[in-house]
């Protein structure tokens, strides 16, 4: 089937353009091209005849083409109107026609874009400002920048008008950006010289600087003022109402206390036609006044919170000096200094920071102290402690229980007996105890700022015959020669008597053993294998007596020396070598040999069968005791004779 | 202004790849429309590609059409012309060119210019 090709199919204005013939029959008499989807005398660009090879222009003729033999048609120097259809008309040589039509389309080099605004110098949030991309071009697509980059999602952006318009709703300061204009058809791309938005804004709220409000007499009073505004604010300044003058500084040298007043600068943007105003407080001292502590938590809360406390008042070039319980600042990473020295910050504060703290303010003459200020931490309550410590009464006697929890504000205290309420007191008062009377017994303390509770419970038995005694120690595998050991027999009970026995024997004077806490309790320093024995405690009282069962002590020793038996050094070539190896331990030890340096096995006893003259050398055990940390290692020569060398050699085993 | 470098060039056979490079420096890479031109022995300069300055749209002249791709790496400064089945045709001194507010087929569009790279296609 005949068609053509347009190559390319989109043609830059200038350009050239070929109109390419695909499947031309065979047996031609001639073919015509005319401009447009149809033949059409009037239309006609060219005719040729094959047979007398000649090309006549036809009324659609321009002079830009040209038409090769196989059909094609090249147009050169295309312009805008050459764009659309083109129909091939073939005569063949039976004088049947055929037709086939191509097209395609020309875009104009595009010309550089400008961007028009409808707003110069939009007011934030109250002006929109529309940019239009110029100059509208047919088939270009239109796009836009800012600062370079593709445009933001927001719904304060807005495109129409097929992208040429850019809209921004309500400008804002941050849409203070550089924007351009891009616009494309199918041969060209054009990008606009950036368009600067000039928002125009404020006064912001001004800051006046420096903070500080308090100054002495003589000194100099320099105040700068600032808001953000644009185009920049102009600046005035009153004094207690009375215009002074329109800068943005004020200076005042040698002040004195007549100048102490109200401050007020007035920043005004007049092409916004805003006024923002902010007054400062300004208060002149005759001499440094007397400072005090201000503090951002009046009530903190143990290991919670961090306290801020503040020199007042702030004086401009003045160094500020603190103390803590009458002495200088002690180094600690929970103390932080600002960089003026007039705040004092605890981070983190404890129960032991409450103070007295001071402040002073250092003059030429002399430093003027604050009035201490004690901190109220809020802590605890801290574990209960009930005492008596007895947990044993006889019947008959006055059951009288206190109960004591550090905590600020002071603890609430409550008492359960066996999880049932009593009452709400520090002290629990039962006269005339009976067995009853055994059982739970639990004191809650409650801090009622923090709103922390704790409670302690103590197990009372109350009998007429005293309890089997238990010994408890604070270590059961105490090592030799390293740790102590305490033994302490249980329980604790009122007007009785504690005894201690070892080995069924009453204890060896030593100073290697102590008793302490009324007896109750039995300390072994320095601890060694032989006292490895069985201990048992005590306890009488006028009416009963009892002893606990033994408790033997294991203590941790060793590996000592170890010893390599038989002790033979000499054995002749082809007997057994038998080696054995012990050491004093406790617990058992682990054995292993090397032979000339070269581990061996990790057994206790080293058999080589038939030794020979190459078994000679160092037979090293090494003993190790996992328990203690502890190691230690003998080294024994073996010589091996070839048989019948020398008399008087062992046989081995 | 921007400073063009060219690299990749090289001899290759016909039906061969090559991926020619140009690094820029001196200005903000991104601010560019890039062109790739080239011009072999005795011809006048010819249109390649061209891509514009966020690298959504590219032209390419018809003779290398569906045959070399443009592209850009803007976070590298670098403009890149991949170019596959390879013609003896397309032996010349590759340019790669710059300009901040035109991107087409036109040479004069471009005031910025590097010093070239040579592709020679041959078996």
């Known amino acids: 089937k005949l068609t053509i090709e347009s190559t390319p199919f989109n043609v830059a204005e200038g350009k050239e353009v070929l109109l390419l013939v695909h499947n031309l029959p065979q047996h031609l008499f001639g073919y015509s091209w005319y401009k447009g989807e149809r033949v059409d005398g009037n239309r006609q660009i060219i005719g040729y005849v094959i047979g007398t090879q000649q090309a006549t222009p036809g009324p659609a003729y321009s002079g830009r083409e040209i038409i090769y033999p196989n059909a094609s048609l090249l147009i050169q120097n295309i312009i805008q109107n050459d764009t659309g259809f083109y129909t091939l008309h073939v005569i063949k040589s039976d004088l049947v026609n055929e037709e086939a039509t191509g097209q395609f389309r020309v875009y104009p080099e595009l010309p550089k874009p400008s961007i028009s605004s409808n707003n110069s110098k939009p007011v934030e949030d109250k002006d929109a400002v529309a940019f239009t991309c110029e100059p509208e071009t047919q088939d270009a697509t239109y796009l836009w920048w800012v600062n370079n980059q593709s445009l933001p999602v927001s719904p304060r952006l807005q495109l129409s008008n097929g992208n040429r318009t850019l809209t921004l709703f309500n400008v804002t300061r941050n849409d203070t950006a550089s924007y351009k204009c891009e616009t494309q058809n199918p041969v060209s791309a054009r990008r606009s010289d950036s368009v600067i938005l000039n928002v125009l804004y404020g006064p912001d709220a001004p800051t006046i600087s420096p903070l500080n409000t308090s100054y002495r007499s003589g000194e100099n009073l320099n105040l700068s003022c600032h808001a953000a505004s644009n185009p920049p604010a102009q600046y005035s300044w009153f004094v207690n109402g009375t215009f002074q003058q329109s800068t943005q500084e004020l200076f005042i040298p040698n002040i004195t206390v007549n100048n102490s007043g109200s401050y007020t600068c007035q920043a005004h943007n007049s092409d916004t036609g805003l006024n923002r105003t902010t007054v400062t407080t300004i208060t002149v001292y005759a001499e440094p006044p007397k400072p005090f502590i201000t503090s951002n938590n009046s009530n903190p809360v143990e290991d919670e919170d961090a306290v801020a406390l503040t020199c007042e008042p702030e004086i401009q070039n003045t160094t500020y000096l603190w103390w803590v319980n009458n002495q200088s600042l002690p180094v600690s990473p929970r103390l932080q200094l600002s960089n003026d020295n007039r705040t004092l910050t605890l981070l983190s504060v404890t129960r032991n920071d409450v103070g007295p703290y001071e402040c002073g303010i250092q003059n030429e003459l002399s430093v003027d102290h604050s009035d201490p200020v004690i901190l109220n931490v809020l802590y605890g309550p801290d574990d209960p402690t009930i005492s008596p410590s007895y947990t044993y009464y006889r019947p008959g006697v006055n059951l009288s229980l206190s109960c004591h929890a550090a905590s600020n504000p002071p603890a609430q205290y409550s008492w359960l007996i066996d999880g049932n309420i009593q009452q709400h007191t520090q002290e629990l008062f039962i006269s005339n105890i009976t067995e009853k009377n055994s059982g739970l017994y639990t004191c809650q303390a409650n801090n009622s700022a923090s709103g922390h509770s704790r409670t302690t419970v103590k197990t009372i038995t109350v009998s007429a015959e005293l309890p089997k005694p238990s010994i408890s120690s604070n270590n059961s595998k105490p090592v030799e020669d390293k740790d102590a050991v305490a033994f302490t027999c249980e329980p604790e009970a009122q007007n009785t008597t504690y005894l201690w026995w070892v080995n069924g024997q009453s204890l060896p004077v030593s100073p290697r053993l102590q008793l302490s806490n009324g007896n109750r309790t039995l300390t072994l320093f320095n601890v060694t294998r032989n006292d490895a024995r069985a201990y048992v405690c005590g306890i009488q009282n006028s009416v009963s007596a009892n002893r606990s069962d033994p408790v033997t002590l294991d203590v941790l020793y060793g590996p000592d020396t170890p010893i390599i038996s038989p002790p033979d050094s000499s054995y002749l070539s082809g007997a057994n070598l038998n080696l054995s190896c012990h050491s004093a331990s406790n617990p058992s030890p682990q054995y292993s040999w090397r032979i000339n340096g070269i581990p061996q096995q990790h057994t206790q006893v080293l058999f080589i069968a038939k030794i020979t003259p190459n078994n000679n050398g160092t037979y090293a055990c090494f003993v190790s005791n996992l328990a203690t940390g502890r190691n230690n290692s003998i080294v024994k020569s073996i010589t091996v004779s070839a048989s019948g060398t020398s008399p008087g050699l062992s046989a081995g085993a | 202004e921007v400073q063009l470098v060219e690299s990749g060039g090289g001899v290759v056979q016909p039906g061969g790849s090559l991926r020619l490079s140009c690094a820029a420096s001196?200005?903000?890479?991104?601010?560019?429309?890039l062109g790739w031109f080239r011009q072999a022995p005795g011809k006048e300069r010819e249109f390649v590609a061209a891509?514009?300055?966020?690298?959504?749209?590219?032209y390419y002249a018809d003779s290398v059409e569906g045959r070399f791709t443009i592209s850009r790496d803007n976070a590298k400064n670098t403009l890149y012309l991949q170019m596959n089945s390879l013609r003896p045709e397309d032996t010349a001194l590759y340019y790669c060119?710059?300009?901040?507010?035109?991107?087409?087929?036109?040479?004069?569009?471009?005031?910025?210019w590097g010093q070239g790279t040579l592709v020679t296609v041959s078996s």
């Open positions: 891509i514009n300055w966020g690298g959504g749209w590219t």
């Open positions: 060119a710059a300009s901040s507010d035109y991107a087409g087929g036109n040479p004069t569009g471009y005031p910025y």
């Open positions: 001196g200005h903000t890479f991104s601010e560019y429309a």
